[in-house]
């Protein structure tokens, strides 16, 4: 399987809400001993590999923001902790998963990564991630609403997989 990022760049005005999205592509094993761990974090475009470094999103670590379930089941994060920080991550039955950030500030600008781990118990973990940029703008040049820029087909299909 792979992870696609429908949009590679989100440009939003300060104070707006945004939902960053990733999508699981390809066959998903729904076997008894296969589970999925999904999470979000901030990162940097590192020299070695994009998304390798895991930084908190609004002081919440990737451990705090994770989703866990089997196959394409719906799930969402621990509400209390995340919502206190204006965050919510969620997953649906169709392989889409997202993080919503409320009341954006300039400090929210940066690179965001979604990580999917397919856990094949007794065998191995299979990691895939996607990356997208969030730019929060203020002043007269800022858009009135979030503007999203689609990933090129090459980018969205060329997500690193372990």
């Amino acid at each position: 399987f792979k992870v696609a990022t429908p949009y590679s760049l989100y440009v939003c005005p300060e104070g707006q809400n945004v939902t960053l999205t990733c999508r699981l592509l390809g066959p998903v094993d729904k076997g008894h001993d296969v589970t999925f761990y999904k999470t979000w974090y901030r990162s940097s475009r590192g020299e070695v590999q994009t998304c390798s470094e895991r930084r908190p999103i609004r002081n919440l670590t990737f451990q705090d923001l994770h989703l866990h379930h089997g196959g394409h089941q719906a799930a969402n994060t621990s509400h209390d902790l995340a919502q206190r920080h204006g965050l919510e991550s969620a997953s649906d039955h169709h392989g889409n998963f997202s993080i919503t950030m409320r009341n954006l500030t300039l400090l929210d600008s940066g690179l965001y990564c979604c990580l999917v781990v397919e856990i094949r118990h007794h065998h191995s973990e299979h990691r895939v991630h996607g990356a997208m940029e969030l730019q929060v703008q203020t002043g007269k040049d800022a858009p009135s609403n979030c503007v999203v820029y689609p990933s090129s087909s090459q980018d969205s299909e060329n997500i690193t997989a372990a």
Partner: antibody, heavy 117, light 107 residues
């Protein structure tokens, strides 16, 4: 702040079953891998196995025939049973939280188990 | 299973010196390697994950590098509290395995 605490007898007789419990406090046990790791005196670390929050288990092949790990989410505890112990099973036993695609990020303080008659 | 070999077994250095610890895997582990520090009577503490990323709260003097089969943990300038045993651990496949450890002792 998640904390782990091992408990169980410090002395077990050869051929008997070693039983330890790890209590998770300050966080949910309903996610992650919950692992047991041991360290014989003066030696290195050996991964024994884990139980995933869903109940799936995975054991080190070198110990698989003797190991059972179980979880009681209502008590926020997971347990290790190691049967037919010998002196070679004398070690400090640690429980640890293992995060998928990450590492063992939180450890208990360890409990020494001696196998002796 | 993947065997991790650490060298040297013991490293005798003075505070302020640079420590270079090696971990070699019997087959490629990509960059899925962690480093832990263990002091006498204590549980191990995570230092580095994914070969080169410092865990939360770990000082910048600790750095990791490498990928595939050869990895290095570097302590740029040893502090008194850094004298301990260091273990590498792979997580590309189960069973998860640790190296035999490198003891960094005061010269």
């Amino acid at each position: 702040q998640v904390q782990l605490q091992e408990s169980g007898p410090g002395l077990v007789k050869p051929s008997e079953t070693l039983s330890l419990t790890c209590t998770v406090s300050g966080g949910s046990i309903s996610s992650y891998y919950w692992s047991w790791i041991r360290q014989p005196p003066g030696k290195g670390l050996e991964w024994i196995g884990y139980i995933y929050y869903s109940g799936s288990t995975n054991y080190n092949p070198s110990l698989k025939s003797r190991v059972t790990i179980s979880v009681d989410t209502s008590k926020s505890q997971f347990s290790l049973k190691l049967s037919s112990v010998t002196a070679a099973d004398t070690a400090v036993y640690y429980c640890a939280r293992d995060i998928p695609a990450f590492a063992f990020d939180i450890w208990g303080q360890g409990t020494m188990v001696i196998v002796s008659s | 299973e993947i065997v991790l070999t650490q060298s040297p077994a013991t490293l005798s250095l003075s505070p302020g010196e640079r420590a270079t610890l090696s971990c070699r895997a019997s087959q490629s582990v990509n960059y899925y390697l962690a480093w832990y520090q263990q002091k006498p009577g204590q549980a191990p503490r995570l230092l580095i994950y994914d070969a080169f990323n410092r865990a939360t709260g770990i000082p910048a003097r600790f750095s990791g590098s490498g990928s595939g089969t050869d990895f290095t943990l570097t302590i740029s300038s040893l502090e008194p509290e850094d004298f301990a045993v260091y273990y590498c651990q792979q997580r590309i496949s189960w069973p998860l395995t640790f190296g035999g450890g490198t003891k960094v002792e005061i010269k």
